[in-house]
């Protein structure tokens, strides 16, 4: 049994880090493998993560972490029984993938303006809470070419757009994702999408 693709990990900078790797053949990850992780910290103790299958030869492990600070560094040991298959380390602050925003809502009752709001996925005491920026994706269910991205570079989790920038009388969907420049993170996953029917009063043409 050998590791074909070494573990790579990302942290949500809160409580979970996710590590994925591939073995050289079909593996029952949960029964055959264990990933031990330990904070490099005086008198800390190792914790065990039981991996799950992620495709035939792929494994994934969700490491539970008691908060994250920038100095954190973990040693990782991948074991198959008594055999050490791989040894490495992981610094969560250098491999951050933020949590996805939630509760995306489209408010259509604001005089020809669409107000999109969503929730910051972090509590106020988390470092990322005040460092997230967002991308909002809006697309038409009827026209695949009608697809747009709005970058929200301010901290408030909301976006206002004129309803008239979208076509009237058709349905649209929106979703939002987040990233944090301070840790050069990857983008989060997209939030679940939300749907609304776009309608607004066309302005009277003046002759």
């Amino acid at each position: 049994m050998k590791v074909l693709q070494e573990p790579t990990c990302v942290s949500d900078y809160m409580s979970i880090s996710t590590c994925e790797w591939k073995m050289n053949g079909p593996t029952n990850c949960s029964t055959e493998l264990r990933l031990l992780y330990q904070l490099v910290f005086l008198l800390s103790e190792a914790h065990t993560c039981i991996p799950e299958n992620n495709g035939g030869a792929g494994c994934v492990c969700h490491l539970l972490m008691d908060d994250v600070v920038s100095a954190d560094n973990y040693t990782l040991d991948l074991w198959a029984g008594q055999q050490l298959l791989w040894k490495g380390s992981f610094k969560p602050s250098e491999h951050v993938k933020p949590r996805a925003p939630g509760n995306l809502t489209v408010h259509t009752n604001v005089s020809d303006t669409l107000l999109l709001t969503w929730s910051n996925p972090y509590p106020p005491d988390n470092y990322l809470y005040n460092h997230l920026t967002y991308a909002v994706n809006i697309w038409s269910e009827n026209d695949p070419a009608d697809f747009r991205i709005y970058n929200v570079t301010y901290l408030e989790p909301s976006l206002r757009i004129a309803a008239s920038t979208l076509k009237s009388g058709i349905s649209y969907r929106a979703r939002v994702r987040a990233w944090a420049q301070c840790y050069n993170t990857t983008w989060s996953e997209w939030s679940p999408s939300t749907k609304w029917h776009n309608s607004y009063r066309e302005p009277f043409e003046q002759h």
Epitope: L42, E45, A71, D72
Partner: antibody, heavy 120, light 108 residues
Amino acid sequence: EVQLLESGGGLVQPGGSLRLSCAASGFTLSSYAMHWVRQAPGKGLEYVSGISSNGGSTYYANSVKGRFTISRDNPKNTLFLQMSSLRAEDTAVYYCVRVFVRYRGGMDVWGQGTTVTVSS
Amino acid sequence: EIVLTQSPGTLSLSPGERATLSCRASQDASNAYLAWYQQKPGQAPRLLIYGTSRRATGIPDRFSGSGSGTDFTLTISRLEPEDFAVYYCQLYGSSSVTFGQGTKLEIK
């Protein structure tokens, strides 16, 4: 209420021994690494020793290495510091301290301290 | 072993003023954890800040920590009468724990 209560301090002659105890209440000792920190009269804080939550790993400051032994009895929620070959410079208030991993080495619960005096 | 040097040794200020206490490490401490404690006469120390900048439970927001590498700072934005005490920085690493010698914050 989360509390640590030290006992066992007293007056001892140079070269003598003493065993300090620390009783924990309001939390489960076995979930935390525990430490001893001391403070000589009118001086600053000095780290002495620590022990991992399951007792499998210990650490000692160079000044006490080979003379002091830290141990714990998790079922009895008690931490110990066995001190031998005591010297005058070991005279101090000894604090029992809890380290919460979430606080990354921040010592969030301290006992009231027990005084050790080494003098002839 | 990393040595922590605090400055100034004594700081004399008045209530309402801003206090800035310094803690300097003898070598890079990026992979260790810096904490700050407050100690009043006859009492055990109290944890204020951990992980360089995070306030412990129940600590007022006038206390803040910052810094990186070798230079760390504890700031008290507006001194209250109960803030006059001795302050210690502490470094908790992978193989040692050390304290600074302390800064005494006294009423001017």
